[in-house]
Amino acid sequence: QRLPRMQEDSPLGGGSSGEDDPLGEEDLPSEEDSPREEDPPGEEDLPGEEDLPGEEDLPEVKPKSEEEGSLKLEDLPTVEAPGDPQEPQNNAHRDKEGDDQSHWRYGGDPPWPRVSPACAGRFQSPVDIRPQLAAFCPALRPLELLGFQLPPLPELRLRNNGHSVQLTLPPGLEMALGPGREYRALQLHLHWGAAGRPGSEHTVEGHRFPAEIHVVHLSTAFARVDEALGRPGGLAVLAAFLEEGPEENSAYEQLLSRLEEIAEEGSETQVPGLDISALLPSDFSRYFQYEGSLTTPPCAQGVIWTVFNQTVMLSAKQLHTLSDTLWGPGDSRLQLNFRATQPLNGRVIEASFPAGVDSSPRAAEPVQLNSCLAAGD
């Protein structure tokens, strides 16, 4: 089943942070406020509104056998995520155990730029992706992944670090964004919402997905993460949206079935090695790409973001397990661990496929396609 193609003229959730609406630095959202009733995390933030820092996702994936029936981003309806009528999850608490307020958190003090000034930068992540405004770049070739199918041994560390669930990856997982753009995978983590509330970091035409997986990579040009921070292309993140589907995702279940063991903040367990690529969509050829930042302090810029067009399907039960099992700081549930979308400030999102082509009669005006800057230039 394919959903109708998204329309260029569909309204975003309250405002645009697209390429055609660059904002000045003074309009950058701050990280300091927790979600408000009238500003549910599921909706696109207005430019200039306070940012809702958000949570991270766990890797969940669509079985390769379902590839044909999988959802594509350009097929999604342009409906805004409904606001949650219940009170928003309050993550802006003071830790009952005496948390040092200088350490960052999702929602609440301190403002992220106080933790790291880079969080007030002009080219931050996540962003709202508007396929109609993406620049089609034929030079963006299919992603290449090597060594992602791990044997059961050695086991991998799965950890609840209070901000997300994180799987540490061993040496040897190689990824190429293109010729001469080679990376090594370091770790993966997830961002999610809460019951009835989506929690992806990136959005598409204002639509927020239930969850999002991030696989973080270090350029082979650098030996250590610290050397790469803030350097263009020093870090690269593969991101995929997680959606609800009818069947259990067996790849994700290998991780989700272990979350109970790491329910407490700071706890960890060992899990058998698995096929990491099975946590990602099967179509490595269709994706969006832009230069942004880490989505948490230190918010270092120069990060190459690659967001898959194809989504990964998990069962409703699996998505519930993801959002309702872990605990974070101060005896609160680890939920809504996502940052609000940030203004593009003139950045152009590139697409490896013609995402802006729309044959629908609803498109009243011609689509203005942005020009492509060839990858590697």
Partner: nanobody
Framework: QVQLVESGGGLVQPGGSLRLSCAAS????????MGWYRQAPGKQRELVAT???????HYADSVKGRFTISRDNSKNTLYLQMNSLRAEDTAVYYC??????????WGQGTLVTVSS
């Protein structure tokens, strides 16, 4: 962003005590969980104990009741008090700081040898 330097290792007799320290520098406010891990010769690195900013602690079963992890945020220092040491505690002990996106930061390690 974050630098970690361990100290306090050495040779101690079975049943003795040692206190390890880990001095953290850089932007440590990006870190939520810190911990101690150890690696014995020919073995995988394993968890010893972790502590969150809020003071929540976790211990490996093998050290529960003998080791205590603590942190002094005012001094940016992580500690591991090790009592009732056994020969099997002999290992290189590493300080760790974990970031949601950047992953693990590690110190250079300090050797603890328990022998009579």
């Amino acid at each position: 962003q974050v630098q970690l330097v361990e100290s306090g290792g050495g040779l101690v007799q079975p049943g003795g005590s040692l206190r390890l320290s880990c001095a953290a520098s850089g932007n440590i406010f990006i870190i939520n969980v810190m911990g101690w891990y150890r690696q014995a010769p020919g073995k995988q690195r394993e968890l010893v104990a972790t502590i969150t900013n809020g003071g929540r602690t976790h211990y490996a079963d093998s050290v529960k009741g003998r080791f205590t992890i603590s942190r002094d945020n005012s001094k940016n220092t992580l500690y591991l008090q090790m009592n009732s040491l056994r020969a099997e505690d002999t290992a290189v002990y590493y300080c760790n700081a974990n970031h949601i996106e950047l992953g693990d930061y590690w110190g250079q390690g300090t050797l603890v040898t328990v022998s009579s």
